[in-house]
Interface confidence: low
Amino acid sequence: LQDLCSNCPAGTFCDNNRSQICSPCPPNSFSSAGGQRTCDICRQCKGVFKTRKECSSTSNAECDCISGYHCLGAECSMCEQDCKQGQELTKKGCKDCCFGTFNDQKRGICRPWTNCSLDGKSVLVNGTKERDVVCGPSPADLSPGASSATPPAPAREPGHSPQ
């Protein structure tokens, strides 16, 4: 009897109720391999999912995410809201960086602005949600007659975290 079932091709199942006859998969189900005793229910692409490939008798449906979302997980098992610079990814989606923090890359979380005063420098350019502060000369260097010994520190290259 097992041999009879192994002859059932993809798109069918071995129907025990009908003397192991190969029956077609019912609507909204599929079998991607031969010799199956049941057909699997087709995946339904609803809500934030949209159908990329319709279900057939031999293959499951494939989903993408609607505009403004991107796929996560193997086989696009989840849709996550698109993130931007100035945001961080949390389990609840993308959140704006809190004041005093920034994220200049597509990965990672919001990080605190550099504390210029720790290096004895002053803030030359204020930080934003997307960019770190730029530290300039120390306040003492800005007094009359003083010359700047070092140029302002360059902003970090976007897309990279400090090493």
Epitope: C65, A74, E80, R107, G108
Partner: antibody, heavy 118, light 108 residues
């Protein structure tokens, strides 16, 4: 079925160039970040580079920065890695992988071997 | 750069035994950004766990991940013959993306 198929590997002399390709199928290529990851013989995995879905944002490991260039052609569903000024330490199997960003690399190609030797 | 250190380097066990693999990060990593892979000789890596504890599609439930901060663990509750392979952890918390050096699970 998602498939990634690398090609373009081979033997090249130090200082030479190679261009790797990765043909993607079975998913909406233009919606995903893509990465190159390499593995030297008998060693572990090393991330090399990634590129965003539009091809406008790229990032590189320090070890290849300035020598390698990642690019993509969404009309051809193909990812590329142009490798210049190759060194012996670049010898590795190079994998392309679909990059889910936070959630890792869910699909990988079979790899293509690049050997840099005189 | 976030350095991931895996231990032990090699784990010698018998089928049916429990395997516990460790991955320690040099700085705190959000658990959302930690993944585990399995690699067999001559094959590409295979995603097992993402988000530190979520199983990828098609991965048997004998594989589980846990941890947060700097310490993460991959557990194989009962080793099957096909589970003997090299396992890597990986972080995508910040650039550059990094992998651990790997743990080889071999048959005792």
């Amino acid at each position: 079925e998602v498939q990634l198929l690398e090609s373009g590997g081979g033997l090249v002399q130090p200082g030479g160039s190679l261009r790797l390709s990765c043909a993607a199928s079975g998913f909406t290529f233009s919606s995903y970040d893509m990465s190159w990851v390499r593995q030297a013989p008998g060693k572990g995995l090393e991330w090399v580079s990634d590129i965003d879905p539009t091809g406008s944002k790229t990032d590189y490991a320090d070890s290849v920065k300035g020598r390698f260039t990642i690019s993509r052609d969404n009309s051809k569903n193909t990812l590329y890695l142009q490798m210049n000024s190759l060194r012996a330490e670049d010898t590795a199997v190079y994998y392309c992988a679909r990059d889910l960003m936070v959630y890792g690399f869910d699909y990988w190609g079979q790899g293509t071997l690049v050997t840099v030797s005189s | 750069e976030i350095v991931l250190t895996q231990s032990p380097g090699t784990l010698s066990l018998s089928p049916g035994e429990r395997a516990t693999l460790s991955c320690r990060a040099s700085q705190s990593v959000s658990s959302s950004y930690l993944a585990w892979y399995q690699q067999k000789p001559g094959q590409a890596p295979r995603l097992l766990i993402y988000g530190a504890s979520s199983r990828a599609t098609g991965i048997p439930d004998r594989f589980s991940g846990s941890g947060s901060g700097t310490d993460f663990t991959l557990t194989i509750s009962r080793l099957e013959p096909e589970d003997f392979a090299v396992y890597y952890c990986q972080q995508s918390y910040s650039y550059p993306v990094t992998f651990g050096q790997g743990t080889k699970v071999e048959i005792k």
